[in-house]
């Protein structure tokens, strides 16, 4: 008799793909634009990225460092009206994109949480949660929670409000901390909280270090759902050299959990390449005219337009990975097993029951390497075959779809491979 199928886990919408952060509407839209009506016109682009949720804002009224002039229920008129917001929500819903609203109170000020008036602010947040839930948002984000006294208890309360309204609503908390113990203490008291942090931000050095960080995190968090990013708000290029961007895209999309990106991550947007642009929110490069300040500073291959036309671009890779992530059971909710593949490499398997399985091999080093895949590290349920088909490489040119002998696998510098192989009873 055929083995019984494993029962599918309950899947929330944020389990099914990536989240896309637009923290600065004006930088995202550019050209002196930057309002909710303009963002509505960019939803087709978000659809093309196959992201599942848009993390928006903050867009509420906030007079820098002034609690009295901070109103979490009012949209800053520079961004548009409540009607514009409702219209954006409706359009996003039609395109199956969920909208998560950032309610970090003092986003224009020094301390995001007005350190001296925590209770006043917490009450404002509570009221805002109820108001915006009624308005139809799908979730909330609050950042810099290391600046919020008694963050765990506030988060628990806000989580109760959010989940009390609907299990289908999400609360995301962001912290600048990269300390695992601090992260765990925030997670312990909040079961379904999605936490973005700087935990992986110093992982760029070696495959072994990254493997160790990822496996420690997964072991420590047990079977709870994770999110993966390099920070709570900043671009990947703030932490990574250009040659590692593809590798990290592949990793973030194939680890068990929700990948979270900032606008521009999909094209390798880099503030350092745009003189005068703020590190935390450079202008989005839609085309070569997006940054007119310095003629010739932007070439076509840095832009959405240029990369959309290039099947070998970072944007094309992002779209392919996002598509795979949202439709393959093993990547959606499969088990994860990391194993040894040799110095400089990080490799793991994702598998779910009798579905197609995936092998990820990442070369963080700047030399080509043979992968010595140590299948002995793996449980019997996740054993490696002799060959697997190459689904994609982060480097161009490899013949996708062809079978590769895993014993003879070699990776170019900074190359990542995603291979697939069938379940074998």
């Amino acid at each position: 008799r055929a083995p019984r199928c494993r029962e599918l886990p309950a899947q929330k919408w944020w389990h099914t793909g990536a989240l896309y952060r637009i923290g600065d509407l004006q930088a995202f839209q550019g050209h002196g634009a930057g309002n909710l009506a303009g963002l509505k016109g960019r939803l087709d682009y978000l659809s093309s990225l196959k992201v599942k949720g848009l993390v928006l804002g903050p867009i509420h009224k906030n007079q820098k460092d002034d609690v009295a002039q901070t109103d979490l229920l009012q949209i800053d008129p520079n961004f548009g009206s409540k009607e514009d917001f409702d219209s954006l929500l409706q359009s996003a819903k039609k395109k199956s994109i969920r909208v998560i609203l950032d309610l970090t109170p003092n986003y224009r000020g020094e301390n995001s949480w007005f350190s001296t008036q925590v209770d006043t602010v917490a009450t404002k947040v509570k009221d805002a949660l109820e108001f915006w839930l009624q308005a139809g948002v799908d979730g909330f984000q609050v950042r810099d929670i290391e600046n919020l006294k008694d963050a765990s208890s506030f988060l628990a309360e806000w989580q109760n409000i959010t989940k009390g309204f609907s299990e289908d609503r999400l609360l995301i908390a962001g912290t600048n901390s990269s300390d695992l113990q601090q992260i765990l203490s925030l997670l312990e008291s909040n079961k379904d909280l999605l936490l973005t942090s700087s935990y992986l931000s110093d992982s760029g050095s070696t495959g072994e270090h990254t493997k160790s960080l990822v496996t420690q995190y997964l072991n420590a968090t047990g079977n709870r759902w994770c999110s993966w990013s390099l920070s709570q708000a900043r671009l990947l290029t703030s932490f990574l050299p250009a040659q590692l961007l593809r590798l990290y895209q592949l990793m973030l999309f194939t680890l068990p959990g929700t990948p979270v990106f900032s606008y521009g991550d999909e094209i390798g947007l880099d503030a350092a390449a745009l003189p005068g642009q703020p590190m935390e929110a450079p202008v989005m490069l839609w085309d070569e005219s997006s940054f007119p300040d310095i003629p010739g500073a932007v070439s076509a291959n840095m832009t959405v337009k240029g990369q959309s036309e290039d099947p070998g671009s970072l944007l094309s890779l992002f779209r392919r990975l996002s598509d795979q992530r949202s439709k393959e059971r093993s990547l959606l909710h499969g088990d994860f097993h990391a194993f040894s593949a040799g110095p400089g490499l990080f490799s793991y398997i994702r598998h779910w029951d009798q579905n197609e399985r995936f092998l990820v091999v990442l070369n963080f080093g700047d030399v080509g390497l043979s992968a010595g895949l140590q299948a002995s590290d793996l449980p019997a349920s996740a054993s490696l075959p002799a060959k697997a088909d190459l689904l994609l490489s982060t480097q161009p040119g490899r013949e996708e779809g062809s079978p590769l002998e895993l014993e003879r696998l070699k990776l170019e510098p900074h190359e990542g491979l995603l291979l697939r192989f069938p379940y074998a009873a």
Epitope: Q243, N301, E309, D310, P311, G312, S316, G368, S370, K387, D389, L390, S393, Q395, P396, G397, R398, E399, E400, G401, S402, P403, L404, E405, R408, L409, K410, L411, E412, P413, H414, E415, R420, F421, P422
Partner: antibody, heavy 124, light 113 residues
Framework: QVQLQQSGPELVRPGVSVKISCKSS????????VHWVRQSRAMSLEWIGI????????DYNQQFKGKATMTVDKSSSTVYMELARLTSEDSAIYFC?????????????????WGQGTSVTVSS | DIVMTQSPSSLAISVGQKVTMSCKSS????????????LAWYQQKPGQSPKLLLY???TRESGVPDRFIGSGSGTDFTLIISSVQAEDLADYFC?????????FGGGTKLEIK
């Protein structure tokens, strides 16, 4: 020596389907994927898709999805391609080819061995 | 998809002469990671299937005479036959092997005067 032997020419009516074959010999069949390429007067050479002889996984060129269906029979080292709902625009020579330029433990889309081609003529 | 454009579409040349044909791609075929350009050239004699001549722009397939020379980088590529022989009468196709789907140029027909 490496050989890819294709089935003979086909003359078919519009609207029907045809299945052509490509039998490999002279190498370890499941070590290499097989590609199909179409050559017509109008469009030069067009890549149709690739089939993994190891797993049977297929990747089609978007333009040929719904038109071409590839299958593999490992026991006879043969790959098949069925072309559906044929029109005069499908009249062409269809080649199977092996991707074989090995570099860094992988292959590249440079095709080192080709079948002799199967002529498909669609005419009423 | 990457579009490949070849020129000229045909040319007639005498035996012993040098011939140059061009191939342009709509996107760069250079992988900056390994500095290789992912371009191949094929020769197709009348009534035969294509035969691989060069890949990675200039790497000769075994058995290909050294009169066939490939060059170029990025989007502009050239195939030179340094001294044309009678048996070189054929169509020549360039093909990018940089990304899926691989795409071919329209071909250059070489005729012998």
């Amino acid at each position: 020596q490496v050989q890819l032997q294709q089935s003979g020419p086909e003359l078919v009516r519009p609207g029907v389907s045809v299945k052509i074959s490509c039998k490999s010999s002279g190498y370890a069949f499941t070590d290499y994927a097989v590609h199909w390429v179409r050559q017509s007067r109008a469009m030069s050479l067009e890549w149709i898709g690739i089939i993994s002889t190891y797993s049977g996984n297929i990747d089609y060129n978007q333009q040929f999805k719904g038109k071409a269906t590839m299958t593999v029979d490992k026991s006879s080292s043969t790959v098949y391609m069925e072309l559906a709902r044929l029109t005069s625009e499908d009249s062409a020579i269809y080649f199977c080819a092996r991707g074989g330029r090995h570099y860094y433990g992988s292959y590249y889309y440079a095709f080192d061995y080709w079948g002799q081609g199967t002529s498909v003529t669609v005419s009423s | 998809d990457i579009v490949m454009t070849q020129s000229p579409s045909s040319l007639a040349i005498s035996v012993g002469q040098k011939v140059t044909m061009s191939c342009k791609s709509s996107q760069s075929l250079l992988n900056r990671n390994n500095q290789k350009n992912y371009l191949a050239w094929y020769q197709q004699k009348p009534g035969q299937s294509p035969k691989l001549l060069l890949y990675f722009t200039s790497t000769r397939e075994s058995g290909v005479p050294d009169r066939f020379i490939g060059s170029g980088s990025g989007t502009d590529f050239t195939l030179i036959i340094s001294s044309v022989q009678a048996e070189d009468l054929a169509d020549y196709f360039c093909q990018q092997h940089y990304s899926t789907p691989p795409t071919f140029g329209g071909g250059t027909k070489l005729e012998i005067k």
